[in-house]
């Protein structure tokens, strides 16, 4: 298997109730505005093939799509959650950002592709969506990196 | 076939300890995160305590918190549950649980039959 | 802690629509992307029915489907059998990371 490096978040960035709840908040709202209930972006599809050792740069890629292709361009939107969510997970991806995999990670690349295919192609739903699951990203997030 | 089997209950006075233990078979043990859920004799279910796939973090019920830890051992395949300050209201069967899929511990799709602790005088 | 409320009993004929809620309060902050459903018969080991508000597990029958409204989800059996007389529990992930069951629901088949 492909040997993953730095790919490891402090467990501190998990234990701030309030920015936390913001980021739950952030997610609950978005839900709320999301009519396609049966698509499923981080889920067990996402992780098909995945081993727990390479899942937290799994979760880097998911992390940074989701900031440059869905939070920035929606920053206007859901306020005031989003202006103190973004900031916070956006340190987290910069924190991720040394995390790499020595060796083939084509799979993993498919996985977050077909991620990727499936906002896209849903448009602005597909973007709020992906919002509406900030909260698996962040539960994703602390399961893998920490 | 996914296989839970819990072990280590028993009769404890109030005060005591008892180590709970649940070998898993049957899948890739360090893949999953896993839970420890007990069910009080005639009530219903309560989540006590779940880990992630390497032991990086631990949560706990309020009610447990302090007296109970939870670990792993990913190369024996099993899941542990330290068992301190045993009070009369935690009596209860003792299940160990995994998630449905990897990386969503909190969807418990697999259970063992669980192991009954009784905390009595 | 957090607190999921269930009525304590659902009860319907054969052939029959019933549905189970599960409500938290509103301070549950996000809970509700979480939420799953477990059947239990007595003397038996809990099933997992529902995962994630509304996805099914392989293998449990598209008679029982999920949703959520707000700070309710619910759990709806449709064609309602005899062999669903059974403890019904919902449960949450919530947003300190513990995980909450709701009281449970005793489903009777008339």
């Known amino acids: 298997a492909p040997i993953s490096s730095h790919c490891r978040l402090d467990k501190s960035n998990f234990q701030q109730p309030y920015i936390t709840n913001r980021t739950f908040m952030l997610a609950k709202e978005a839900s709320l505005a999301d009519n396609n209930t049966d698509v499923r972006l981080i889920g067990e599809k996402l992780f098909h093939g995945v081993s727990m050792s390479e899942r937290c740069y799994l979760m880097k890629q998911v992390l940074n799509f989701t900031l440059e292709e869905v939070l920035f361009p929606q920053s206007d939107r859901f306020q005031p959650y989003m202006q103190e969510v973004v900031p916070f997970l956006a340190r987290l991806s910069n924190r991720l950002s040394t995390c790499h995999i020595e060796g083939d990670d084509l799979h993993i690349q498919r996985n977050v592709q077909k991620l990727k295919d499936t906002v896209k192609k849903l448009g602005e739903s597909g973007e709020i969506k992906a919002i509406g699951e900030l909260d698996l990203l962040f539960m994703s997030l602390r399961n893998a990196c920490i | 076939e996914v296989q839970l089997v819990e072990s280590g209950g028993g009769v404890v006075r109030p005060g005591g300890s008892l180590r709970l233990s649940c070998a898993a078979s049957?899948?890739?043990?360090?893949?999953?995160?896993m839970n420890w859920v007990r069910q009080a004799p005639g009530k219903g279910l309560e989540w006590v305590s779940g880990v992630n796939w390497n032991g990086g973090t631990r949560d706990y019920a309020a009610s447990v918190k302090g007296r109970f830890t939870i670990s792993r051992d990913n190369a024996k395949n099993s899941l542990y549950l330290q068992m301190n300050s045993l009070r009369a209201e935690d009596t209860a069967l003792y299940y160990c649980?995994?998630?449905?899929?990897?990386?969503?511990?909190?969807?418990?799709?697999?259970w063992g039959r669980g192991t009954l602790v009784t905390v009595s005088s | 802690q957090a607190v999921l409320t269930q009525p304590s009993s659902v009860s319907g004929s054969p052939g029959q629509s019933i549905t189970i809620s599960c409500t938290g309060a509103?301070?549950?902050?996000?809970?509700?992307?979480?939420v799953s459903w477990y059947q239990q018969h007595p003397g038996k080991t809990p099933k997992l029915i529902i995962y994630d508000v509304n996805k099914r597990p392989s293998g449990v029958s598209n008679r029982f489907s999920g949703s959520k409204s707000g700070n309710t989800a619910s759990l709806t059996i449709s064609g309602l059998q005899a062999e669903d007389e059974s403890d019904y529990y919902c449960a949450s992930l919530v947003s300190d990371f513990s995980v909450v069951f709701g009281g449970g629901t005793k489903v009777t088949v008339l």
């Open positions: 049957g899948f890739t043990f360090d893949d999953y995160g």
């Open positions: 509103s301070g549950d902050v996000g809970a509700y992307n979480f």
């Open positions: 649980a995994r998630g449905w899929y990897s990386g969503a511990a909190w969807n418990m799709g697999y």
